[in-house]
């Protein structure tokens, strides 16, 4: 059975994201970038004041990362 990635905690990224709604925070370069291709609303946290996700899902997985987090396939984007 395929395993998902380990928790990706530890990278210096602010939480919540400092980006404007049309942008995503790229963890590789640590700044906001356009997310226009996604055409999706910003995920809403469920009862969490800090929705910053720190665990990655399998890229093959779709939506449903857990409480209020969305793990969306991101086709390249950058």
């Amino acid at each position: 059975m395929r395993r998902g990635p380990r928790s990706l905690r530890g990278r210096d990224a602010p939480a919540p994201t400092p980006c404007v709604p049309a942008e995503c925070f790229d963890l590789l370069v640590r700044h906001c970038v356009a997310c226009g291709l996604l055409r999706t609303p910003r995920p809403k946290p469920a009862g969490a004041s800090s929705p910053a996700p720190r665990t990655a899902l399998q890229p093959q997985e779709s939506v449903g990362a857990g409480a209020g987090e969305a793990a969306l396939p991101l086709p390249g984007l950058l």
Partner: antibody
Framework: EVQLVQSGGGVVQPGRSLRLSCAAS????????MHWVRQAPGKCLEWVAV????????YYGDSVKGRFTISRDNSKNTLYLQMNSLRDEDTAVYYC???????????????????WGQGTTVTVSS | EIVLTQSPSSLSASVGDRVTITCRAS??????LNWYQQKPGKAPKLLIY???SLQSGVPSRFSGSGSGTDFTLTISSLQPEDFATYYC?????????FGCGTKVEIK
């Protein structure tokens, strides 16, 4: 089939220029960031440059900064590497590769390079 | 720049052997570590991403582990097609960096 086909390599004298091309097929090129990576004979892999899906951002390795320019033409599904002021130490096999990323919440995480071109040889020699 | 140190630089093994390759980062990179296989005259191929996730189409005999600074690639039962050079690569920060490879040769 997802494919990257490279062209443009060859033998060039020090100080001259060369442009490499990487033609993409089998996926929506305009939605992917792209890299150039090189490998000198018998040496380690060295990252050269990356360009965003829309060319809005570009980053370069220190050894090529100011001499090489990464660009793309999404209408032609093609990635380019313009190499100027070539040096002996630029001799290598050059690979184009697709950036592998996924969105987690509103954060982009990087998983490396998941599709590679076949490589093209650049030899800088007088 | 994050430096990745692979060990051993080469090893000899037989078909069916369990092979372990290590990669050490000069600073913590969380789990942003990927593994590639390269055969002579060919481009690298992504095997493992995010330290432990198997890339689509890669045989399950390949596995990865580790986080922080120490990572391992394991081939549970070496097959004839696995003789190649293996590279680790960090995607924690720009510039992307690679280890210098571990060549797996036939004993």
């Amino acid at each position: 089939e997802v494919q990257l086909v490279q062209s443009g390599g060859g033998v060039v004298q020090p100080g001259r220029s060369l442009r490499l091309s990487c033609a993409a097929s089998g996926f929506t090129f305009s939605m992917y960031g792209m890299h150039w990576v090189r490998q000198a004979p018998g040496k380690c892999l060295e990252w050269v440059a990356v360009i965003w899906y829309d060319a809005s951002n570009k980053y370069y390795g220190d050894s090529v900064k100011g001499r090489f320019t990464i660009s793309r033409d999404n209408s032609k599904n093609t990635l380019y590497l313009q190499m100027n002021s070539l040096r002996d130490e630029d001799t290598a096999v050059y690979y184009c590769a697709r950036r592998f990323t996924r969105l987690r919440g509103w954060y982009i995480e990087d998983y490396g390079l998941d599709v590679w071109g076949q490589g093209t040889t650049v030899t800088v020699s007088s | 720049e994050i430096v990745l140190t692979q060990s051993p630089s080469s090893l000899s093994a037989s078909v069916g052997d369990r092979v372990t390759i290590t990669c050490r980062a000069s600073q913590s990179i969380s789990s942003y570590l990927n593994w590639y296989q390269q055969k002579p005259g060919k481009a690298p191929k992504l095997l493992i991403y995010a330290a432990s996730s198997l890339q689509s189409g890669v045989p399950s005999r390949f596995s990865g582990s580790g986080s922080g600074t120490d990572f391992t690639l394991t081939i549970s039962s070496l097959q004839p097609e696995d003789f190649a050079t293996y590279y680790c690569q960090q995607s924690y920060s720009i510039p992307l960096t690679f280890g210098c490879g571990t060549k797996v040769e036939i004993k």
